[in-house]
Structure formats: C-alpha cells, structure tokens
Interface confidence: medium
C-alpha cells in the first residue's frame, strides 16, 4: 500500500506538473529523488505534445499507450509487428544490445517490454529471439486515437516451432532402411556414386551395415549415424553431406544413448565388472592418446582423487562458472582455451580428444547474429592451462589450427541444436600432467551415466556472475574453475524454457528446491561436461556447454550438447580428413 | 641449481613486527605457489601460509591470519612473510618453500635453510 | 582441522633393519599425504608425496602405503644416512598439517 508520504507526493506532482507545466526541480521538489525525478522527466518531456487536454497527458503518463514517437511507452507488449517475441534488454542472446538499462536508464528497459529508447521514428521496437532478426518494432495503441503504431504483420510461415507432420509421413529409425532416391544434400550439392573410386577408397575403413544397400548415389545411413542418411560430395576428398528427410521423433530409449525420459533405477553398483577400454578411433587420423583417454597424470595414474569427484561418484551410487571453486592443478587436464590473436581474448572453451584433435562447440566459431565466423588464421588454443590470463611458461603449449569442421546441420537460426565443431592441430601437442585427451562416450557408457540426477562436472574460464562490471567484486576467475551439476529430466528440461530442445541436447543444474546452486556462464562455451565412470575410473566427455539463459537462475538450467549422439559426425570428420593436410596459401 | 634463501629473522620484543625475505634462483619463480613453514624449537612442523603464483590468493593458518601477511614479487623472485603484533609463541625457525607440482598441490619440494625469529622481552 | 597421529614418536632401529612409521589422520585425506625427512640443523626433504610417489632421488628402500586414514612410510633396510626425524603432512583440507614427527635413532 502507499504510505501517506507517497500520496501527498503524488498530489504533489499532479499539482505542479500535471494541472500546470512543471520544470524538472519542481518534479525534483515533489519526487525528493533523483533517480525518481529522472525517470519521471523521460516520461514528462516524452509528453510534451499531449499536455491538453489532461485526461490525454494522464493516459499518456501512464504508458500504456504511445504518444508521437512513443518514447513515453511503458506497457508490456513483448512481442514484434510480425509475432517474433521480444528479447530480453539484458541478455545478450541472440544479439548484443547496444542499447541498455545503463546507456539508457530512464527508458526504462524492463523484461523484454517494447520501448522506444532512441527516438526511433517507427516507435516502440525491441530486439528479437529470432537470430535472423535483430530488431523490429511493435504494434503498440496510439494514445487518444483508435490506431496503433504500425500494424501487425504476422510472418506467414507461421510459428517458428516445427510442428509434427503425421507419423505416416516421416522416416523411422534415422533412415537406416530408407530406400527413397534422394541424391542432394541438405546444402544442395550432388551426392557421389557409392560405387565411384572416391567413394568406395573412403568406405574402406568404415564399419558399414551390410543390410543396407548403397544404390546409385542416393542418400543412405549405413553406419546408425544418429543425424541420418547421407552420401560423399565432390570436394574436398572425403567431404559428405547429410540429406534432409523428415525423421520420425522417436522416444528416446537406450539406444539414443541416455535415460533422460523414463524413469530410470538402473543403480550402478548393481554393475561391479571393470570393463576395459575399447578404442574407437583409428589412430592413423585420430592421432595417439585414445587408449590412455580419461586417465589424469596427477589424478588417476597416481591413485589421487581430486577433491570433488567423490561427489560424482556418489550421485551415480544413490559453476561463465557460477558457484564454482578454483579447480586443481590437473584436475582437467583436456581443458583448452580458446584464444583469439587480434584482439587477445579469451573466446571460449574446447577439450582435447587426442593429440591432434580438439571439441568445441560451434557457435564459438560461427554466430552470424553477433558477426562472429572465425577462420583458422583468427585462433589459437592454449592447452594445460590453469591460469586464465598469464602465460605459464613450460606448462602451457600454443597450437596453430590447421582446420576447423562445423557441423553442418548446426542450427544457430533458431536454437543452437547440433552445437558442436572440430578443430585439429597444425602439429600434435605433447602430452605431460597438464595435458591429456578426454575419453569420448560409446553407447554403453553414454546409457549408463547420462542419467537424471547423476553428476557431471563443468570446468572453464568464464565469467563467475551473469553481469558483472570491473569495479564490483569478482567478475572473471584468476584460475580455471570447476563446478559440479546434476543432470536434469529431459521433460523438466524442455519445461524450463520457451526455446525448442532437441535430443542433441541434455540440461543441468540444480533445480530451485534443491539448496546448491552453479551454472556454466559466458566464456564456459565449448568447454566439457565431463562424468567419471565407476566401471574403468575413466573420464568421459559427455556434453558441451552450449547455452542458458542467464547464468544460474532459478528454474533456468544450462544446456549442452550431447556428445554422444554426435559421436558418428566426429567420427565421420575424423576418419575423412585426419590424414589430409591442408595447407592454406 | 634450484635454491631458496631467507633473510630478516632476528631478536623482537613482543608486540614488535618483522619482514621475512626467501630470494628464489634455478628455476622460474613466477611459475610456483609458495610458502612458508615454521618450526618451533625442539617441535614439529608447522604450516603458516601459502601464495599462488601471481599473488592474487593467500591462505593462513586461522590463529595468524589477523597478524601475518604473505606476499611476493615476481620480478625480483622474492617471496616475503610480514609478521605483526608478534608473541612468544611465534619463535620458531622459518622456512620458505616452493611447492611441488606449479600449483595447489601443498606439498614442499624445495626449501630454504630457515631463519631464526626470537620473540622475547 | 585434520589432525595427524604419528607413531611411534621415536623408535631405535639398526643398519638393516626395516622400520615402519603409522601416520593416522582424524578424517579421510584420499592419499593426500606427503612424508618427510630432516636431519638436525638442516631443512625437511620431501621423500614421498600422493601416499605412494617417491621423489625424484629418493632411494626405493623408502616406500609410502596406505588408504583413507590410515598411512605407512616403510624403510626396507636402514641406512646410516637414514637416522633422522621423519613427518608426515596431509594436504587434503586447510590448514595443511603434519604429523608429531617420529625420531629414528641408532639403537
């Protein structure tokens, strides 16, 4: 309720501003607050042109309706003229806004509400969650009139959300018994013959399911790629393309690799054989470093347990890094920094796989909303850090790029789905107790660990709160940090967010009742999300930090793609282009 | 070679303050978390205070941390211990020490021959 | 705090003999534990760091065992070189703490 002051400063006001004209130290006098009298005044001087009669300045005042060029607009419409909902002033996803709550506090840029902060001639606009659009103004009422400020338009291929065509018309099992004669890739170019030279030299070393038949050029999945039929292309040798068809969504069982949908007891003490480890990549392309994967110098080869992983451990049995800690030395030794040359910065995480090869996640490099699309020559990965910002001489190793390999059906339109790159080395790094590759999941230990509630760990550079300025506490981490999060039930997941979460995606973090916070945060992207397993004592890379909303919100958790899932596209790239060198003139 | 030497230890009253030095040479300094460990006459060893490589992070042993200030500077390989408000209890022998992997680990790897700190009236 | 128990706290040994040396910490420090050596007058030697590494230089007659709270610094055959106190240090949890320390004298 308003106290007596309020009310005798509201009359106040209305007396000296509202039934005459007032100047700003007359609305000081009667605000008694600067900060108050500020956005008072925004609103006041935006009503210049409606001071009579004085219902029209009162409606006016208020905002819910837009006088001129609507720079008094104080509603809450969030959505565009053509229906694209508005993003929020303070993110920074998926665009970077020039305009803010600090360039521009008394416009008073709340949630996602349209605002007109730079007097633009159309009206109230915001900036939008489309990628492909960064700003679009709103239809907002015209004060006193039966109009509004431009007209809605909405976009006509509807909803952005993909809807589900009948079962009848879509693709079962990934198209592992496709027999259509689809022969283009998603990108439009020819497929090969799988019969031509190129080809069959390429399909040599490939486990292939003798079932299915490679006729003439068309678009086949004949090693269970998740991602679905595909075919070689003219090119670069060994380039393929993926071909688009419309696949069924089908539940995700054990097969897809996690048991994120049902509710799942399989308990992990139940399984008490160590398995071995088997490599899965050919070493000739792979380069060295699978067979001791996952095994830490300072760690596991020392019979060492890090500080934190028994808490891993023990959720199998029964934190940018926000609410993080400083990590170990070694503790993650596969982490790498992502570096660009000019200017030097700390663009993200990534992890190293083997010793030529290094994950990231693809909008690390290709985010066309924020004019980001590095090349080979833009980059650098700084491996067996744990400082982030000095130079730790005969610790740390510099590599050159030779290439980088974006997924080619990563989605950065719409929702960062298949958010994964490759980047391989110029020369392979040396392994030492600082650096050392990650194991990557077979399905086996994809389906046991990728589990509701079962820990995985987050370590990385990034920023230790969601907004931060260089004079109030601690922004950015002398030191890697390391946070550790349960995995969350994929329906939970989905529920958190308007974004649509696709199955190359799995989230985590702590939900608002469970009393421990953490989350991944900007300049975490890239990086592993990496789980223990208690059957061989190895580390594997089960995610990588894609994206959230915020940092460490309640009921918001961080997304990551599924690394697993997209195993046969890592794999693909590797075996095709491991051996090839590229050299740039 | 690698070797760490300290300096400042002497006679002080109680209530009186000194600065300890330990110059590092034979390996790079500014790589290494260090530390100082004290050792009171016939007794064991007592750990006092360590420091991360570039000096942004500091840990005391709690009864200390009011009175004793770690520090370092990189481009002179010094590492110093500020000792105020000193009692009896604080004579002991001061020894500097590099850790053993370039980072968190707390193990000593390497130390210096000590120097003497008598608190006495 | 963690404490650390050493025992016993001086024992007397000859050439050749083998000696074992417990360290017992109040709560578990997952192999966190360093043991070292010092002679009078002179500055601790680290011998055995992660429970069970020896340091570079070290003889093997040195050897570190143990899990969870309960540790052992076993020397297989007493050397002249070896009479000395040696301690033990745990650096699982601040503060780092060492054990009593644990006097081999010539008997």
């Known amino acids: 309720a308003n106290t007596f002051l309020e009310e005798v400063r509201k009359g106040n006001l209305e007396r000296e501003c509202v039934e005459e004209t007032c100047s700003y130290e007359e609305a000081f006098e009667a605000l008694e607050s600067s900060t108050a009298t500020d956005v008072f005044w925004a609103k006041y001087t935006a009503c210049e042109t409606a001071r009579t009669p004085r219902d029209k300045l009162a409606a006016c005042l208020e905002g819910n309706c837009a006088e001129g060029l609507g720079t008094n607009y104080r509603g809450h419409v969030n959505i565009t003229r053509s229906g694209i909902e508005c993003q929020l002033w303070r993110s920074r996803y998926p665009h970077k806004p020039e305009i803010n709550s600090t360039t521009h506090p008394g416009a008073d840029l709340q949630e996602n509400f349209c605002r007109n902060p730079d007097s633009s001639t159309t009206g109230p606009w915001c900036y939008t969650t489309d990628p492909t659009v960064r700003r679009q103004e709103c239809s907002i009422p015209v004060c006193g009139q039966d109009q509004v400020t431009v007209a809605m338009t909405p976009r006509s291929e509807g909803s952005s959300v993909n809807l589900s065509p009948p079962l009848e018309q879509c693709v079962p099992d990934r198209g592992q018994q496709y027999q259509g004669r689809l022969a283009v890739t998603t990108h439009g170019l020819p497929c090969l013959a799988w019969a031509s030279a190129q080809a069959k030299a390429l399909s040599k070393h490939q486990d292939f399911n003798s079932a299915v038949q490679l006729v003439e050029n068309f678009c086949r999945n004949p090693d269970g790629d998740e991602e679905g039929v595909w075919c070689y292309v003219a090119g670069k040798p060994g380039d393929f393309g993926y071909c688009d068809l419309n696949y069924c969504e089908e539940a995700v069982e054990e097969e897809t690799g996690d048991g994120l949908d049902e509710d799942s007891d399989r308990a992990i003490e139940g399984r008490t054989a160590t398995s071995e480890y088997q490599t899965f990549f050919n070493p000739r392309t792979f380069g060295s470093g699978e067979a001791d994967c996952g095994l830490r110098p300072l760690f596991e080869k020392k019979s060492l347990e890090d500080k934190t992983e028994r808490e891993l451990l023990e959720s199998y049995i029964d934190g940018r890094i926000v609410e993080g800690s400083d990590a170990e030395i070694g503790m993650s030794p596969w982490q790498v920094m992502l570096f660009r040359k000019s200017p030097q910065e700390l663009l993200c995480g990534a992890s190293l796989i083997s010793d030529r090869w290094v994950l990231t996640a693809a909008h690390c490099l290709l985010y066309p909303p924020w004019d980001k699309n590095f090349t080979e020559n833009d980059l650098l990965v700084r491996i067996g850090k744990h400082s982030r910002t000095r130079y730790e001489r005969n610790i740390e190793k510099i590599s050159m790029l030779e290439k980088i390999y974006i997924h080619p059906r990563y989605n950065w339109r719409e929702n960062l789905d298949r958010d994964i790159a490759l980047m391989k080395l110029k020369k392979p790094v040396a392994f030492s107790d600082y650096i050392h590759p990650v194991c990557l999941p077979d399905r086996e230990t994809a389906a046991s660990l990728l589990q509701a509630g079962y820990k995985g760990r987050v370590t990385g550079w990034g920023n230790l709160k969601e907004t931060w300025t260089a004079n109030v506490g601690k922004g950015q981490p002398s030191v890697l940090q390391v946070v550790n999060l349960p995995i969350v039930e994929r329906p939970v997941c989905k529920d958190s967010t308007r974004i649509r979460i696709t199955d190359n995606m799995f989230c985590a973090g702590y939900k608002p009742d469970e009393g421990k916070r953490g989350d991944a945060c900007e300049g975490d992207s890239g990086g592993p999300f990496v789980m223990k397993s208690p059957f061989n004592n190895r580390w594997y890379q089960m995610g990588i930090v894609s994206w959230g909303e915020g940092c460490d919100r309640d009921g918001k958790y961080g997304f990551y793609t599924h690394v697993f899932r997209l195993k046969k596209w890592i794999q693909k790239v590797i075996d095709q282009f491991g051996e090839h060198h590229h050299h740039h003139h | 070679e690698v070797q760490l030497v300290e300096s400042g230890g002497g006679l002080v009253q109680p209530g009186g303050s000194l600065r300890l030095s330990c110059a590092a040479s034979?390996?790079?300094?500014?790589?290494?978390?260090m530390a100082w460990v004290r050792q009171a006459p016939g007794k064991g060893l007592e750990w006092v205070s360590n420091?991360?490589?570039?000096?942004?992070?500091?840990y005391y042993l709690d009864s200390l941390k009011s009175r004793f200030t770690i520090s370092r500077d990189n481009s002179k390989n010094t590492l110093y211990l500020q000792m105020n408000s000193l009692k009896a209890e604080d004579t002991a022998v001061y020894y500097c020490?590099?850790?053993?992997?370039?980072?968190?680990?707390?193990?000593?790897?390497?130390w210096g021959q000590g120097t003497t700190v008598t608190v006495s009236s | 705090d963690i404490q650390m128990t050493q025992s016993p706290s001086s024992l007397s040994a000859s050439v050749g003999d083998r000696v074992t040396i417990t360290c017992k910490a109040s709560?578990?420090?997952?192999?966190?534990l360093a043991w070292y050596q010092q002679k009078p007058g002179k500055a601790p030697r680290l011998i055995i760091s992660?429970?069970?590494s020896l340091e570079t230089g070290v003889p093997s007659r040195f050897s570190g065992s143990g899990s969870g709270k309960d540790y052992t610094l076993t020397i297989s055959s007493l050397q002249p070189e070896d009479f000395a106190t040696y301690y033990c240090?745990?650096?699982?949890?601040?503060?780092?703490?060492f054990g009593g320390g644990t006097k081999v004298e010539i008997k």
């Open positions: 020490a590099r850790d053993h992997y370039m980072g968190n680990s707390y193990v000593f790897d390497t």
């Open positions: 034979g390996f790079t300094f500014s790589d290494y978390y």
């Open positions: 420091i991360n490589s570039d000096g942004s992070s500091t």
């Open positions: 709560e578990d420090i997952y192999n966190r």
């Open positions: 992660g429970a069970t």
């Open positions: 240090q745990q650096y699982w949890s601040t503060p780092w703490t």
